[in-house]
Amino acid sequence: LIIGFGISGRHSITVTTVASAGNIGEDGILSCTFEPDIKLSDIVIQWLKEGVLGLVHEFKEGKDELSEQDEMFRGRTAVFADQVIVGNASLRLKNVQLTDAGTYKCYIITSKGKGNANLEYKTGAFSMPEVNVDYNASSETLRCEAPRWFPQPTVVWASQVDQGANFSEVSNTSFELNSENVTMKVVSVLYNVTINNTYSCMIENDIAKATGDIKVTESEIKRRSHLQLLNSKAS
């Protein structure tokens, strides 16, 4: 969480951003809030990116003002116009690119003053893993697959029964480059699985951590997946 202050006229206003991560090829949100102002026509929102000459986005007098927008963001940005009046300056970024990573500034002007805060935006790829029993294998085997990751993650297996056990000797992980030549498909196989146990396949890079759980009993198989972004710090 980054909280910034600015001084203008009577007041400085508080602007708050939250560091976040974008999943390349998908839409992302750069989060920014500010002390709301009841005078919508006086509110100006500017998004800037370090090292980029033009603006990322500008909203003023109740609408987008994109005449000074940098080419790399053309047609890819939008604020939540209906939410500006209640202090939401968050930016929607369409079709996130690897090159969108960097330091952004959310700069706000209202009738009460000015303020800004920086935001670290990481980009990569992350996806939910799915763990299945591999019935084609000669022994009881689990197969963990996740379709899109970047940068290359680590994969670690864990078990509820054998807590703390190291499964690296009985697992095999491969990374297969996807067609766009950036992201990779993650496949990890765990051998010598016992029933009546819960196994977890944990995939992690510097952006996200995802876990796929599978519980195998004689009568049923239960699965659960969870994904967590690692860098959601507010400013």
């Epitope: 709301p36 009841i38 005078k39 919508l40 009046i85 202090g87 009460k112």
Partner: antibody, heavy 117, light 107 residues
Framework: EVQLVQSGAEVKKPGASVKVSCKVS????????MHWVRQAPGQGLEWIGA????????EYAPKFQGRVTLTADTSTSTAYMELSSLRSEDTAVYYC??????????WGQGTTVTVSS | DIQMTQSPSSLSASVGDRVTITCQAT??????LNWYQQKPGKPPKFAIY???QLAEGVPSRFSGSGSGTDYTLTISSLQPEDFATYYC?????????FGGGTKVEIK
């Protein structure tokens, strides 16, 4: 659940003052503007003013400037509207209304103020 | 101040009718317009925000449209519970201003 609960009806004499309260629950009171709107019998809605409780910033409609005072007690999440030098044309239902998710999204139940000699 | 002219001031309609209410601003309000429904003895109820977005719990027979200075609230098929007074509100320029209201009555 968001709730704005206002104080009860008041009967006042011309020249007197009235203070109406609005107790808020269900959202962060200090971080959003609270507005006051009134409605004379059989008439439309008229904006009086607004307060930002976190900083006690206030904005008033020019018509009410100098005669209305908006305050807030952040410890009890209660907003107050005081109108002075009352006259018969101030007879109305007075509403508090929040701007939490959108402009005037939640409303109090209203407080009837009657000014009569 | 921006003036909001709402029309008609009242209308009579039957259940099932399509009803249209308009609000005209004295200048461009850039879609910064909400609609409220009020029944006798009750506070106004938030119905439509930012010209066309339905508030939570509002039936899909209600819709809003418009841009610039001209805005419309439409009820596609009037239901018994829709008989009420409707107000528009502009919040683009300070101070916020309401339209004069439209009373929708049973024919």
């Amino acid at each position: 659940e968001v709730q704005l609960v206002q104080s009860g009806a008041e009967v006042k004499k011309p020249g007197a003052s009235v203070k109406v309260s609005c107790k808020v629950s269900g959202y962060p009171f200090t971080s959003y503007w609270m507005h006051w709107v009134r409605q004379a019998p059989g008439q439309g809605l008229e904006w009086i003013g607004a307060i930002y409780p976190g900083k006690s910033d206030t904005e008033y409609a020019p018509k009410f400037q100098g005669r209305v005072t908006l305050t807030a007690d952040t410890s009890t999440s209660t907003a107050y509207m005081e109108l002075s030098s009352l006259r018969s044309e101030d007879t109305a239902v007075y509403y508090c209304t929040s701007t939490w998710t959108h402009y005037f999204d939640y409303w109090g139940q209203g407080t009837t103020v009657t000014v009569s000699s | 101040d921006i003036q909001m002219t709402q029309s008609p001031s009242s209308l009579s309609a039957s259940v099932g009718d399509r009803v249209t209410i308009t609000c005209q601003a004295t200048q461009d309000i850039v879609k910064s317009l909400n609609w409220y429904q009020q029944k006798p003895g009750k506070p106004p109820k938030f119905a439509i925000y930012y010209t066309a977005q339905l508030a939570e719990g509002v039936p899909s027979r209600f819709s809003g449209s418009g841009s610039g200075t001209d805005y419309t609230l439409t009820i596609s098929s009037l239901q018994p519970e829709d008989f009420a007074t409707y107000y528009c509100l502009q919040f683009y320029e300070f101070p916020p201003t309401f339209g004069g209201g439209t009373k929708v009555e049973i024919k």
